[in-house]
């Protein structure tokens, strides 16, 4: 099939989870092809390594695309030390990397 | 690790998870053991646009996964989206309502 760029979404940790002392930030890459995609996490513009995990779906039987979730996991204390959370996505279907971000505590 | 039921947290739709006419929302199913869990949406009445990702094994020895669904953004304020999580090994069933974050 032809190249399909991912749709990228970012989710902050829920208030429920923060009450438990942990913060998971999720970046979703939806319906892309080919499978190769790179996700980089940045916290206050500092590149993160070693504290995220990725999971990729099987190839979709209808449109042959893939989807990927990347989860950045931090302690609540670490999460609350920083403001800007961003996932940067690189993929063949994107002319330049796409960044989705949010400011902690803001809608 | 001994048997442990998951915690289920909402991945709430917001302007950061909306693109044009599409909104994404989901559930984070975290810290369970052993595999597997099953996730459905609206008791199986919503299947189109659903992606339930393979579980990942965390450093804690517990599993975690996310299930997400894309929906028309126009539907967010008019109906309820619920993820139904079942972890048979711990006899845990959780129905989590996922709503737009109220600011």
């Amino acid at each position: 099939r032809t190249v399909a760029a991912p749709s990228v979404f970012i989710f902050p940790p829920s208030d429920e989870q923060l009450k438990s002392g942990t913060a998971s930030v999720v970046c979703l890459l939806n319906n892309f092809y080919p499978r190769e995609a790179k996700v980089q996490w940045k916290v206050d513009n500092a590149l993160q390594s070693g504290n995220s995990q990725e999971s990729v779906t099987e190839q979709d039987s209808k449109d042959s695309t893939y989807s990927l979730s990347s989860t950045l996991t931090l302690s609540k204390a670490d999460y609350e030390k920083h403001k800007v959370y961003a996932c940067e996505v690189t993929h063949q279907g994107l002319s330049s990397p796409v960044t989705k971000s949010f400011n902690r505590g803001e809608c | 690790a001994s048997t442990k039921g998951p915690s289920v947290f909402p991945l709430a739709p917001s302007s950061k998870s909306t693109s044009g006419g599409t909104a994404a929302l989901g559930c984070l199913v975290k810290d369970y053991f052993p595999e597997p869990v099953t996730v459905s949406w609206n008791s199986g009445a919503l299947t189109s646009g659903v992606h339930t990702f393979p579980a990942v094994l965390q450093s804690s020895g517990l599993y975690s996964l996310s299930s997400v669904v894309t929906v028309p953004s126009s539907s967010l304020g008019t109906q309820t989206y619920i993820c139904n999580v079942n972890h048979k090994p711990s006899n845990t069933k959780v129905d989590k309502k996922v709503e737009p974050k109220s600011c």
């Epitope: 749709s7 319906n31 979709d60 209808k62 449109d63 695309t65 | 693109s19 044009g20 006419g21 599409t22 609206n42 199986g44 009445a45 919503l46 299947t47 189109s48 646009g49 894309t70 929906v71 028309p72 953004s73 126009s74 539907s75 304020g77 008019t78 109906q79 309820t80």
Partner: antibody, heavy 110, light 110 residues
């Protein structure tokens, strides 16, 4: 932001027909889209919906009679073997109903 | 598919009067209901979505209410420009619901 349907014409029964919906001022690719029709002097009739990954849902009466598909820039409605009962104005619209095309007239007659 | 039953089929009221249109869904659709106004030769125009939320630019004389299976559109202080046919539509997103329209209500202004 607007939609426009094209492809409506006079056809004989059984002649395959494809209608196309295109958008101006916004990208169709992130929108669920509906096809709706209206026979002369009659009410609105939902045909089906296509979601962003190309999966379509149809009214029970439309299954097997119509096929909805999409590209990155268009949404198509195909009638494989139209009958005289399919004579109508066909509209495409966003799922939320806030944007409609003006409609395109299909006349099926021998 | 959800079936939408709309009543009455037609109604005639004087300028300044009030019209009430009812729409019943065959199963619960929460507040996933839209109301449209359509004039001859034009596509439908969205008036209300989410059962009660007024679309931008629509006068507050139009009021939607209801949830579950029973819905109402009320038009007060009728004006000549309100002469049109009004439709309800199920906008619930999920398997086997569909986005059916009610049969329409023709509103005439005396």
């Amino acid at each position: 932001q607007s939609l426009e349907e094209s492809g409506g014409r006079l056809v004989t029964p059984g002649t395959p027909l494809t209608l196309t919906c295109t958008a101006s001022g916004f990208s169709l690719s992130t929108y669920w889209m509906n096809w709706v029709r209206q026979a002369p002097g009659k009410g609105l009739e939902w045909i089906g919906t296509i979601n962003i990954d190309g999966s379509a849902a149809y009214a029970s009466w439309a299954k097997g009679r119509f096929t909805i598909s999409r590209t990155s820039t268009t949404v198509d409605l195909k009638a494989a073997s139209p009958t005289t009962e399919d004579t109508a104005t066909y509209f495409c619209a966003t799922y939320g109903g806030d944007i409609w095309g003006p409609g395109t007239l299909v006349t099926v007659s021998s | 598919d959800v079936v939408m039953t709309q009543t009455p089929a037609s109604v005639s009221e004087p300028v300044g009067g009030t019209v009430t249109i009812k729409c019943q869904a065959s199963q619960s659709i929460s507040t996933a209901l839209a109301w449209y106004q359509q004039k001859p030769g034009q596509p439908p125009k969205l008036l209300i979505y989410g059962a009660s939320t007024l679309e931008s630019g629509v006068p507050s004389r139009f009021k939607g209410s209801g949830s579950g299976t029973e819905f109402t559109l009320t038009i007060s202080d009728l004006e000549c420009a309100d002469a049109a046919t009004y439709y309800c539509q199920c906008t619930y997103y999920g398997n086997n619901y569909g986005n059916a329209f009610g049969g329409g209500t023709k509103v005439e202004i005396k």
